[in-house]
Amino acid sequence: QVQLVESGGGLVQPGGSLRLSCAASGFTFSYYDIQWVRQAPGKGLEWVSSISPSGQSTYYRREVKGRFTISRDNSKNTLYLQMNSLRAEDTAVYYCARRTGREEGGWIFDYWGQGTLVTVSS
Amino acid sequence: EIVLTQSPATLSVSPGERATLSCRASRSVRRELAWYQQKPGQAPELLIYGASTRETGIPARFSGSGSGTDFTLTINSLEAEDAATYYCQQYRDPPGTFGGGTKVEIK
């Protein structure tokens, strides 16, 4: 079955860096847009970044643009999020999620990982 | 960006009763709206897309309705396992925005 497993979260100081990974299985990874969605403690969901199936096209929410880099390795069925210049407001559980492959499905996220916690604090 | 306002913030319902959750968009999203369920410590799960189409495997007691700016998620015959926070998401303007969530508690 479809599985997404995030890793790489942890405690980091403001200004620091972290690299998150998301290992995918149970589907043809290279066919799908994948994104990172985050959730600050006790808060709602916030889309962060998306990457096209080939990895050639990316898009970021403005608050992270220039600091975060989304990438993927289709040979390893893995998605990455390189986070630099981290701020306290980046503290959140980071989920990777698959955009549905359903024809005319739009930006619906049909499978999610369990999330990895990133804490930015001194 | 399109802002989604969910109400109420918290809803307390007895087992077997009906829960009605509202989501209002700041401008029309046609029917391009999804609902997700998130249980404590778990990832969100897609329930409804296209405002009213149930995702595969989602029980029939979950139903979505609405179009334009006003949407409703109805949970009939509420069960204990339905205790969760529910989020609406518009995808009219990619990649979409989420509402603030409605927490459903079981009395």
């Epitope: 096209s52 199936p53 | 399109i2 401008r27 303007d93």
Partner: antibody, heavy 118, light 110 residues
Framework: REQLEESGGDLVKPEGSLTLTCTAS?????????VCWVRQAPGKGLEWIGC???????TAYASWAKGRFTISKTSSTTVTLQMTSLTAADTATYFC???????????WGPGTLVTVSS | DVVMTQTPASVSEPVGGTVTIKCQAS??????LAWYQQKPGQPPKLLID???DLASGVPSRFKGSGSGTEYTLTISALECADAATYYC????????????FGGGTEVVVK
């Protein structure tokens, strides 16, 4: 390498119809791209015609283009622009362009020339 | 539809000089603004998105700024290769408001 190429440009008589095709290579439209058509009359500026979100099928058109122009995703690598009731004012180079998630265009085709004349 | 008004229509500056191009939107487009460079016989090339973010490979001599309805492209240390026509473009809420280009500014390098 990801590329777009337009085809179908031709000399057509006034009131005639024409379908242009935008073909992707190095990637497919199975992802959610905005694929848009933009035209440029000889010696003039860029004019947006319309777009299709290849992931959802949503379309958006310039006010003046509604009714006469139709954008469709016809396969995982092709998007078409159907044009009807053509007039001399539609003479232009027609470009297709791609944006990811939003419609700023980091990939353009070289353009195809449409001439409407009797 | 959003309307983009671009000024001036043409500007001539010497090599090493600075060019400023302005673009006004008919409504607040929340910085969803791109700038393109187009040379004769070629398709446009993306220079800047989100009003101020340089596209990959674009030199830092190109600078975008602005918010709300008022946006500016500044080209400093002008080079001969910068001779081209420049267009602004809004892409705010495409499904609702569509896409709109400015009328273009021809930059002549003396």
């Amino acid at each position: 390498r990801e590329q777009l190429e337009e085809s179908g440009g031709d000399l057509v008589k006034p009131e005639g119809s024409l379908t242009l095709t935008c073909t992707a290579s190095g990637f497919s439209f199975s992802s959610s791209y905005w694929v848009c058509w933009v035209r440029q009359a000889p010696g003039k500026g860029l004019e947006w015609i319309g777009c299709i979100d290849t992931g959802s099928g949503n379309t958006a058109y310039a006010s003046w283009a509604k009714g006469r122009f139709t954008i469709s995703k016809t396969s995982s690598t092709t998007v078409t622009l159907q044009m009807t009731s053509l007039t001399a004012a539609d003479t232009a180079t027609y470009f297709c362009a791609r944006g990811y998630v939003v419609a700023h265009f980091n990939l353009w085709g070289p353009g195809t020339l449409v001439t409407v004349s009797s | 539809d959003v309307v983009m008004t671009q000024t001036p229509a043409s500007v001539s500056e010497p090599v090493g000089g600075t060019v400023t191009i302005k673009c006004q939107a008919s409504e607040d487009i929340e910085r969803y603004l791109a700038w393109y460079q187009q040379k004769p016989g070629q398709p446009p090339k993306l220079l800047i998105d989100d009003a101020s973010d340089l596209a990959s490979g674009v030199p830092s001599r190109f600078k975008g700024s602005g918010s709300g309805t008022e946006y500016t492209l500044t080209i400093s240390a002008l080079e001969c290769a910068d001779a081209a026509t420049y267009y602004c473009q809004s892409y705010y809420a495409i499904s609702t408001y569509g896409v709109a280009f400015g009328g273009g500014t021809e930059v002549v390098v003396k």
